[in-house]
């Protein structure tokens, strides 16, 4: 059975929008009027992971690209990276772990963990036009929760 | 080798609450997730629900409202808590061990407890 | 939920017989679908996983096949200690669920 996916694009609680920054590379910046066409759009599929009554296991792959948010160690920290894949084998149900993230809904916001990497986040920082990344706290200076905007395909 | 062993009391009360433990050898449950599994006598299985390696447990919709799963990682001890029973939930009751191989068989149940009845009477 | 339907709900069969079993899901689930033998005041062993992997230690003659919603479990040649219940199980989802089970009596 094809994996269910959605369209969506993410803005972070600072209505931040996400961007591509070079090929493998996300940023987050405010977005306005026309501009806001450069934002990703992501193609979030529901896959196996483990799941909890209250986080639903996801891969974040961008929309008609072949490129999927992914966690991996580097340096021996948890990081967050866009990886290549092969179009013809994904999206898939069964992911591999390092693609997987837990989507929680808080409050009307979402937050994504790695499920690789309990406790890490995707995450944005105050300042704008930084990258996106893989942060280990929630509820300090950097931005943890997320706004989804649905696309239609 | 994996083993999983059930142990609790075998009467409760209407209107108690259900308490047994699964203490697990043979693995980590850091690492595996187990399942809570139930049979009525005579009848078929019924899945309760889960604690995954991280703590993160999913309860099945019926139940939902009166159970808890935790676990002591420690000890190597899962416990399940269902309040408010009646008799509709007598059942031999069996804790498994979920394969948890990522990207491959995340959510069958391979190793099983030999299971212990409860049955709720007054 | 995903819904299970097995059939028979009962079957007799004598020793030497080959003997089906059929789970139908009420979704495509690929191939996550296991089968397990449960006999009487023990456990359900796991003897089949992804439809058709034959777990360690279980003997041939037990085979598993399909793929989306219509499964099959076959035993090639009954033996007097493959009389027990058999249940299918779909590991596609959470929640899990289980078919009604079929008893395979001697005849």
């Known amino acids: 059975a094809p994996v269910r996916s959605l369209n969506c694009t993410l803005r972070d609680s600072q209505q931040k929008s996400l961007v591509m920054s070079g090929p493998y590379e996300l940023k987050a910046l405010h977005l306005q009027g026309q501009d806001m066409e450069q934002q990703v759009v992501f193609s979030m599929s529901f896959v196996q992971g483990e799941e909890s009554n209250d986080k639903i296991p996801v891969a974040l792959g961008l929309k008609e690209k072949n490129l999927y948010l992914s966690c991996v160690l580097k340096d021996d920290k948890p990081t967050l990276q866009l990886e290549s894949v092969d179009p013809k084998n994904y999206p898939k149900k069964k992911m591999e772990k390092r693609f997987v993230f837990n989507k929680i809904e808080i409050n009307n916001k979402l937050e994504f963990e790695s499920a690789q990497f309990p406790n890490w986040y995707i995450s944005t920082s105050q300042a704008e036009n930084m990258p996106v990344f893989l942060g280990g706290t929630k509820g300090g200076q950097d931005i943890t929760d997320f706004t989804m905007q649905f696309v239609s395909s | 080798e994996v083993q999983l062993q059930e142990s609790g009391p075998g009467l409760v009360k209407p209107s108690e609450t259900l308490s047994l433990t699964c203490t697990v050898s043979g693995f980590s449950l850091s690492d595996y997730g187990v399942s809570w599994i139930r049979q009525p006598p005579g009848k078929g299985l019924e899945w309760i629900g889960l604690i995954w390696g991280s703590g993160d447990t999913y309860y099945n919709s019926p139940l939902k409202s009166r159970l808890t799963i935790s676990k002591d990682n420690s000890k190597s001890q899962v416990s399940l808590k269902l309040s408010s029973v009646t008799a509709a939930d007598t059942a031999v009751y069996y804790c498994?061990?979920?394969?948890?191989?990522?990207?491959?068989?995340?959510?069958?149940?391979?190793?099983w407890g030999q299971g212990t009845l409860v049955t709720v009477s007054s | 939920d995903i819904q299970m339907t097995q059939s028979p709900s009962s079957l007799s069969a004598s020793v030497g017989d080959r003997v089906t079993i059929t789970c139908q899901t009420s979704?495509?689930?690929?191939?996550?679908l296991n089968w397990y033998q449960q006999k009487p005041g023990k456990a359900p062993k796991l003897l089949i996983s992804l439809a058709s992997t034959l777990r360690p230690g279980v003997p041939s003659r037990f085979s598993g096949s399909g793929s989306g919603t219509d499964f099959t479990f076959t035993i090639s040649s009954l033996q007097p200690e493959d009389f027990a219940t058999y249940y299918c199980l779909q590991s596609d989802r959470l929640p899990l669920t289980f078919g009604q089970g079929t008893k395979l009596e001697i005849k």
């Open positions: 979704t495509d689930i690929d191939d996550d």
């Open positions: 498994a061990k979920q394969t948890n191989i990522w990207a491959y068989d995340l959510y069958s149940m391979d190793y």
